[in-house]
Amino acid sequence: GPETLCGAELVDALQFVCGDRGFYFNKPTGYGSSSRRAPQTGIVDECCFRSCDLRRLEMYCAPLKPAKSA
């Protein structure tokens, strides 16, 4: 079931979920991709003080970068 994630555990979980995309705790975009990356309460409030699932954690991943054409 869902569990709380804090400190280094939270960072490890984000690295696992986001992979090469990376992640950030900062400003969401105004609209479009990543504009709803994070719930209003913030990742610590959402995942450390309470439990959160992987889908919610993924909202903090950086957007996928389109593949560069040759």
Epitope: Y31, S34, S35, R36
Partner: antibody
């Protein structure tokens, strides 16, 4: 609890400007985009634009570029919208609304602007 | 600009009826982050709008389960399984995958 408290109704002259406010409380004001929405009497909702209070970044819908100017003061958790060169077309109720993961989940009560000579 | 076309614009119902509102977008609202940026709002007479459904099909906290959202890409639907008096008002779809826009609104009213 989250609240967005807007300033009171305005009666203004054509050609003038008006600045309305939206005071936020109960959440981290700087970390969420604040949106502004227009509703003319008996009409639908029009998205005007949005501001990120953390750094002042803005996005505007085309029709409102040059008409609306969005600003925010993080120290007082207040967002502002100034409307310039007012005409009768600007007579409307204006709403502020924060947007986050759940969409625009909290709205102000609306500010009525009446443009009349 | 993305245009959202709502149908019908007026929807007369009896209490207890099922109601269905369509919202069609001129562009796909599926974003590269895997989310589809389509929400539904209700504005009751004399009140500020309130969110009902976010990201196509998720009911906002406190919204009764008689409300449901569905769809993908460019075609979306809001359904009310059994209309109650408190549901009367104007329903708007809203997209924020591109520069945000609202649909024109659907007025749910009594026959």
């Amino acid at each position: 609890q989250v609240q967005l408290q807007q300033s009171g109704a305005e009666l203004v002259r054509p050609g003038s400007s008006v600045k309305i406010s939206c005071k936020a409380s109960g959440y981290a004001f700087s970390n969420l985009w604040m949106n502004w929405v227009k509703q003319r009497p008996g009409q639908g909702l029009e998205w005007i634009g949005q501001i990120y209070p953390g750094d002042g970044d803005t996005n505007y819908y085309g029709d409102f570029k040059g008409k609306a100017t969005l600003t925010a003061d993080s120290s007082s958790s207040t967002a502002y919208m100034q409307l310039s060169r007012l005409t009768s077309e600007d007579s409307a109720v204006y709403f502020c609304a924060r947007i986050g993961y759940y969409g625009m989940d909290y709205w102000g009560q609306g500010t009525s602007v009446t443009v009349s000579s | 600009d993305v245009v959202l076309t709502q149908t019908p614009l007026s929807l007369p119902v009896n209490i207890g009826d099922e109601a269905s509102i369509s919202c069609k977008s001129t562009k796909s609202l599926l974003s590269s982050d895997g989310l589809t940026y389509l929400d539904w709002y209700l504005q009751k007479p004399g009140q500020s709008p309130q969110v009902l459904i976010y990201l196509v099909s998720n009911r906002f906290s406190g919204v009764p389960d008689r409300f449901s959202g569905s769809g993908s890409g460019t075609d979306f639907t809001l359904k009310i399984s059994r209309v109650e008096a408190e549901d009367l008002g104007v329903y708007y779809c809203f997209q924020s995958n591109y520069l945000p826009t609202f649909g024109a609104g659907t007025k749910l009213e009594l026959k």
